[in-house]
Interface confidence: low
């Protein structure tokens, strides 16, 4: 048999809180336990579900959990079934609701001296107790013509008067908790002795020296009083006015007129109405003085034809907000079309050249008007006034290539030489009108030149070839002074270039003809065997038909070229001894000898006491030291010729003689015999 060890029992439960209906069974075989609510099987949900044999409630819900629960145990093998005792919840709850008018049926029917009943729609179980409030203040029974019972949900005002006007709310509490009205009720019972607003003053904005009018009206029975105050609570009347409101007038209907408004009149004006009974009504309005600031400047604008562009006008700060409009040629722009105003923007659609000009943004309010001009340029593609022409430019002279164009705005011109941009330097200069100047034309300037003229609307370009007209010149110019070696063959070249290949000939400066052993072969003067008489002044003459002739003068000297009679040798000297480096040279003119030691010329006037250069050219160094070691170069030179020869100098320590060495033992290497420099010890 199936036996219930624990049966569910009826119990108190709180709305929205946890609960558990217990059920435990004992049976010989396996049993299946399920629950019924009002005879229908209970399905598990997240809120309500079987927990073992018991039924668990995560949050009791008044509508869903009201009814009779029963636990059923069934043996599916034998078919035996047992049911528990019935159990139900006593659910405690409270739910907020509005304050509503119960009597009379509508607000329109509320009159002074009628009975008014309000109901508090807060419900709960157990039945809550109620508390009423007017304007947040609790109401108690028997006070000021109203009936209220904490057990009753109604508030009765009998009779209702103006003193009952206000915002009514209610709260209720029970064992479960507390709730207050979700919507309150405003009771308005007019008292004709209270001041009521008929006309409220509005904020005004006026220009300096203009007039301002504030309207203000109240009604009451008997008629209410009306008073105006300004800012610092100073009353304004026609009899006594503060000094800065000398031009104020209060009319019988309550309106306040201010004439010739000044800055000090700006501020808050208060209109106060007071009935025979009730609180004063204070209405405020502000007088603003109109103002308008300056407008920012526009940058000039450049647009291209066919494009759409916009120019925004930033309105100046001002009160009231300034209105903004655009004008062109004294005419206000429309709000649609090809050139029109949209908001604060000037819009130019499909721009035409004729749209160029000055456009003016205007801003205005009561305080005045501001304007700012914007200059609009419509860019055009440049057109040619003068293209660059193929040109012949003379070498060595300035050359000019024109690139004259016109456009709006003024076009910028750049030049290219062999497709490379020409940057202005000492040789090239681009003038404001686009002309290129080559300061000193050179042969290699003969090439292609291209100029490009541009505006934002587009660019044009043209090219021209430059041919350089070479000047007649020696290439290279002959050296003005040249030497020839006596008794040897010699040549003196002279070559020149020009627009036409020039003819070149040599002559002696004195006009005498060249001897037969001297030939002039296409500009090269050839001496078969130089004699002393060949010395002298010669002139090379280059000439052609178109350019005439040019001359170069050359002084030829006949010389015996330098040869060394004696050359310095590799020399090794003991430290402290004297080194002699010999050098003798011959030639005509007689050569001069200079020495170079360790990469610097030895100046005979600054040699110091240890060094000396003899008349014949030999160099002597006394009391040699290791730092004198190095390469020494003998340089022989005259007006025609220069030759050099070099040898190293080694300075070594003198070895100390050993016992085994005899007095005649040779040094370990060959020494140049020099004189020992004796030191005298005092």
């Amino acid at each position: 048999a199936i036996v219930f060890i624990k049966q569910p029992s009826s119990q108190d439960a709180l709305q929205g809180r946890r609960a558990l209906l217990r059920c435990e069974v004992e049976a010989p075989g396996p049993v299946h336990v399920y629950w019924l609510l009002d005879g229908a099987p209970v399905q598990d949900t997240e809120r309500r579900f079987a927990q073992g044999s018991s039924l668990s409630f995560a949050a009791v819900d008044r509508p869903q959990d009201s009814g009779t629960f029963q636990c059923v145990a069934r043996d599916d093998v034998t078919g035996e079934e047992a049911r528990s005792a019935n159990a139900s919840f006593n659910i405690k709850w409270i739910e907020a609701g509005p304050v509503v008018l119960k009597h009379p049926a509508s607000e329109a029917e509320i009159q002074p001296q009628t009975q008014v009943t309000l109901r508090c729609h807060i419900d709960g179980h157990p039945r809550p107790t109620y508390q009423w409030f007017r304007d947040g203040t609790p109401l108690s029974d028997g006070q000021s013509n109203h009936t209220v019972s904490s057990k009753e949900r109604n508030l009765t005002l009998r009779p209702a008067g103006p003193e009952h006007s206000g915002l009514y709310s209610c709260c209720a509490h029970s064992a479960f908790g507390q709730a207050c009205s979700s919507q309150n009720f405003t009771l308005s019972i007019a008292d004709e002795s209270f001041a009521r607003v008929v006309l409220a003053p509005q904020d005004v904005v006026v220009a300096r020296y203009e007039e301002a009018m504030f309207h203000c009206q109240f009604s009451a029975q008997p008629p209410p009083s009306l008073q105006w105050l300004f800012e610092d609570e100073t009353p304004i009347t026609n009899r006594s006015r503060p000094p800065h409101l000398r031009r104020a007038t209060v009319f019988a209907n309550g309106s306040l007129l201010l004439t010739q408004v000044r800055p000090r009149n700006a501020g808050i004006y208060r209109c106060i109405g007071q009935g025979q009974r009730g609180p004063p009504i204070i209405l405020e309005a502000t007088l603003h003085l109109a103002e308008i600031e300056d407008m920012p400047l526009f940058e000039p604008r450049v647009f291209t034809a066919g494009s759409e562009e916009r120019v925004t006008c930033l309105p100046p700060k001002g009160l009231p907000e300034p209105s903004v409009w655009w004008e062109h040629a004294g005419v206000r722009l429309p709000t649609h079309g090809r050139v029109y105003q949209k908001g604060h923007e000037l819009v130019l659609a499909n721009i035409a050249e004729s749209d160029a000009g000055v456009y003016t943004c205007h801003a205005a309010n009561l305080a005045g008007q501001r304007r700012q001009d914007v200059n609009i340029t419509v860019a055009t593609v440049p057109s040619w006034l003068k293209k660059p022409q193929d040109s012949q430019l003379e070498e060595g002279k300035p050359g000019y290539l024109d690139c004259l164009t016109q456009a709006t705005p003024k076009p910028t011109v750049v030049w290219y030489r062999n497709q490379m941009l020409i940057s202005e330097d000492s040789r090239f200069e681009v003038f404001k009108n686009g002309t290129l100047r080559i300061n000193s034309v050179e042969v290699y300037d003969g090439t292609w030149y291209r100029c490009m003229s541009s505006t934002p609307a587009g660019s044009i370009e043209a090219q021209a070839r430059v041919q350089v007209l070479e000047k007649l010149k020696f290439t290279p110019p002959p050296q003005p002074q040249q030497c020839m070696e006596f008794d040897k063959e010699a040549t003196v070249p002279c070559s020149a270039t020009g627009r036409e290949k020039p003819t070149i000939k040599w002559e002696r400066a004195d006009g005498s003809s060249l001897p037969e052993w001297v030939t002039d072969n296409a500009g090269t003067l050839h001496f078969a065997r130089v004699t002393r008489d060949d010395a002298g002044n010669y002139t090379c003459i280059a000439s052609n038909g178109p350019q005439g002739q040019i001359r170069a003068h050359v002084q030829l000297t006949v010389a015996v070229f330098i040869t060394f009679k004696v050359e310095p040798e590799r020399t090794t000297v003991y430290q402290g001894h004297t080194a002699l480096l010999q050098c003798e040279a011959q030639g005509d003119p007689k050569p001069l000898i200079q020495w170079k030691g360790k990469d610097r010329i030895l100046d005979p006037t600054k040699l110091g006491p240890r060094m000396h250069i003899f008349q014949n050219g030999s160099l002597v160094i006394h009391d040699v030291a290791p730092e004198d070691s190095g390469r020494y170069t003998c340089i022989a030179g005259n007006s025609c010729n220069i030759k050099h020869t070099e040898a190293p100098l080694y300075v070594v320590d003198k070895p100390v003689p050993e016992e085994s060495e005899g007095p005649g033992s040779p040094p370990p290497y060959k020494m140049i015999q020099t004189h020992h420099h004796h030191h005298h010890h005092h």
Partner: antibody, heavy 120, light 107 residues
Framework: QVTLKESGPGILKPSQTLSLTCSFS??????????VGWIRQPSGKGLEWLAH???????YYNPSLKSQLTISKDTSRNQVFLKITSVDTEDTATYYC????????????WGQGTLVTVSA | DIKMTQSPSSMYASLGERVTITCKAS??????LNWFQQKPGKSPKTLIY???RLLDGVPSRFSGSGSGQDYSLTISSLDYEDMGIYYC?????????FGAGTKLELK
Amino acid sequence: QVTLKESGPGILKPSQTLSLTCSFSGFSLSTSNMGVGWIRQPSGKGLEWLAHIWWDDDKYYNPSLKSQLTISKDTSRNQVFLKITSVDTEDTATYYCVRSNYGYAWFAYWGQGTLVTVSA
Amino acid sequence: DIKMTQSPSSMYASLGERVTITCKASQDIYPYLNWFQQKPGKSPKTLIYRTNRLLDGVPSRFSGSGSGQDYSLTISSLDYEDMGIYYCLQYDEFPLTFGAGTKLELK
């Protein structure tokens, strides 16, 4: 841009009349809300307001000097004038011309000032 | 006449320091008060108009505040360029009146 420049006699003797001219550019006294005034500053001392004239010829004077002061304008020539009669050594000061824009910044623009010395 | 009392009459401050100069009117002048800066041998320059509005081009380290009778000029972080004499001006009523000035020098 807005510029104002004062000009005056430099030196004058007590009891003479001081005539000052303010020449301005960058705005017009025919524009509503524009005004020009005069302020002076004795060397090493503070600033003293003298007079003001508005675009509509409304004029205001410092009451302490009112009987000596006359302010006027020539709108077409962009000039404002100030006359001070019966000057004394105490009127030695730098005189500044200033622009006001009613409902915007009063004295936003100042001239460089002109030094007037009253000496016997 | 409205009397403007400026304080302090002179002060020393260090670079980067926050500096405040005050001006008290003998009656309510709100909001009609300007602040000026004057450097030796130069014309005064307007910094602030209508109590708290910065004139175009004036560095944002300058600010003005106040209402009724009490007004102040504040330099949030003193710069070498800010040395000079500062004046306040009321333009609520004619005659217009200036404060006596505050000389600001480098400490």
